[in-house]
């Protein structure tokens, strides 16, 4: 899908807009809010009833090169006694983010935007019961 | 920036790091993944730490619509459907990259922006405060 025009109307293109070749767009990868910090509750991945681990994926041809993925530790959820309760399910919560992919074609380099699905953490859910006819 | 492996046959002038500004194809790879979390799963209703999804829309951003989760309760829902306050519902937050139109309103000029979104909620045991 192409990036949509601003809103749903055709805005007047401001005079200050840079010239861009057809079929492409200019992207500044100096990140706005680069230094903001996540203020998530302390070590929730361990305190959760659906705990998870983190793994870092690394790809030098991707920007950002490092993407952190969560994996649920259990199929069930952890009960008050610290035991796994398989009557409940730990499930992944996912979120899309954008990355820039660098592609080499011979000696020329091109850049492509890519949507990546990141598993952020896990939550404990009641299972769906399928009734057999 | 980040270093990339260099093709030995290419001229040496190539920068090892990502340049500050790049020209990218207007088509986005993997664009068909579902962006509406309400349609992709009903975890937000079935979770012991259920959440509501709030639509955040900004035409100067791509994607223009982002769904923000807000935990419905401070406690967690137990097997009887009651709220347990000896457990807490907390948001799971994630930094994501989006495109911000720069300069504003320009159709094909963007800058990457990092934003913090609450994706869902999880049920946690409360923090133990040790009194000195």
């Amino acid at each position: 899908r192409k990036i949509p025009k601003v809103g749903h109307t055709f805005f007047q293109k401001p005079e200050s807009c840079p010239p861009v070749p057809g079929g492409s767009m200019k992207l500044d990868i100096g990140i706005i809010n680069e230094n903001q910090r996540v203020s998530m509750s302390r070590n929730i991945e361990s305190r959760s009833t659906s705990p998870w681990n983190y793994t870092v994926t690394w790809d030098p041809n991707r920007y950002p090169s490092e993407v952190v993925q969560a994996q649920c530790r259990n199929l069930g959820c952890i009960n008050a006694q610290g035991k796994e309760d398989i009557s409940m399910n730990s499930v992944p919560i996912q979120q899309e983010t954008l990355v820039v992919r660098r592609k080499h074609q011979g000696c020329s380099v091109s850049f492509q935007l890519e949507k990546v699905l990141v598993t952020v953490g896990c939550t404990c859910v009641t299972p769906v019961i399928h009734h057999v006819q | 920036g980040i270093t990339i492996p260099r093709n030995p046959g290419c001229p040496n002038s190539e920068d090892k790091n990502f340049p500050r500004t790049v020209m990218v194809n207007l088509n986005i790879h993997n664009r068909n993944t579902n962006t509406n979390p309400k349609r992709s799963s009903d975890y937000y209703n079935r979770s012991t730490s259920p959440w509501n999804l709030h639509r955040n829309e900004d035409p100067e951003r791509y994607p223009s619509v982002i769904w923000e989760a807000k935990c419905r309760h401070l406690g967690c829902i137990n097997a009887d459907g009651n709220v347990d306050y000896h457990m807490n519902s907390v948001p799971i937050q994630q930094e994501i990259l989006v495109l911000r139109r720069e300069p504003p309103h320009c159709p094909n000029s963007f800058r990457l922006e990092k934003i913090l979104v609450s994706v869902g909620c999880t049920c946690v045991t409360p923090i133990v405060h040790h009194v000195a």
Epitope: - | H73, V83, Y85, H86, S89, T125
Partner: antibody, heavy 118, light 113 residues
Framework: EVQLVQSGAEVKKPGATVKISCKAS????????MHWVQQAPGHGLEWMGV????????AYNQKFKGRVTITADTSTDTAYMELSSLRSEDTAVYYC???????????WGQGTLVTVSS | DIVMTQSPDSLAVSLGERATINCKSS????????????LAWYQQKPGQPPKLLVD???TRESGVPDRFSGSGSGTDFTLTISSLQAEDVAVYFC?????????FGPGTKVDIK
């Protein structure tokens, strides 16, 4: 200073509906929950239900059998409790009280007396 | 629902003497993960809303005189007024906030002998 100010006393006929407001100030309304408690003469304190204005979740006491509805307006930092199908035994003082993530209810409104009489 | 019981229903104590109120819950209010008991004690005077005195069984709220103390764990709890003052005449309630529906004890009326 945290304050919860409730609407004034009401006199209602059996079968009617009453809606009481509770205006919060002195704290971030969406960071806490609002609980409602009934105190009927000779019946002690009865928890009715709770709302989390920041997340929209509600929970109710089944003893009120679907007659109670709790809402919140985050634009005015006000919580509401509506009790329908009123009967004489609903004559009571109704309190709103702020709850935290541990369920601690530390600040209470001044109470609203509802009298149900034909 | 968790049932809360209190004893005695009422008691009369001389000024400066000790008053002890007991509260029992039908199930444990102890959260093993943080070792907290989700039990609160309230004081209510005529025409006023309840006032939180003690929470988590033994944590006194700020501004509450130190003659008030709470103790107990699991299902058995006690509120003690070490030296009764005239302004302590009131009804005292215990309440569990472990799970909904929150439930209160029937109250204990404290008077001066």
């Amino acid at each position: 200073e945290v304050q919860l100010v409730q609407s004034g006393a009401e006199v209602k006929k059996p079968g009617a509906t009453v809606k009481i407001s509770c205006k919060a100030s002195g704290y971030t309304f969406t960071d806490y929950e609002m609980h409602w408690v009934q105190q009927a003469p000779g019946h002690g304190l009865e928890w009715m239900g709770v709302i989390h204005p920041g997340g929209g979740g509600t929970a109710y006491n089944q003893k009120f059998k679907g007659r109670v509805t709790i809402t919140a307006d985050t634009s005015t930092d006000t919580a509401y409790m509506e009790l329908s199908s009123l009967r004489s035994e609903d004559t009571a003082v109704y309190y709103c009280t702020r709850g935290d993530h541990d369920g601690r209810t530390d600040y209470w409104g001044q109470g609203t007396l509802v009298t149900v009489s034909s | 629902d968790i049932v809360m019981t209190q004893s005695p229903d009422s008691l009369a104590v001389s000024l400066g003497e000790r008053a002890t109120i007991n509260c029992k819950s039908s199930q444990s209010l102890l959260n093993r993960s943080n070792q907290k008991n989700y039990l609160a004690w309230y004081q209510q005077k005529p025409g006023q809303p309840p006032k939180l005195l003690v929470d988590f069984a033994s944590t006194r709220e700020s501004g509450v005189p130190d003659r008030f103390s709470g103790s107990g764990s699991g299902t058995d709890f006690t509120l003690t007024i070490s030296s009764l003052q005239a302004e302590d005449v009131a009804v005292y309630f215990c309440q569990q906030h472990y799970t909904t529906p929150f439930t209160f004890g029937p109250g204990t009326k404290v008077d001066i002998k």
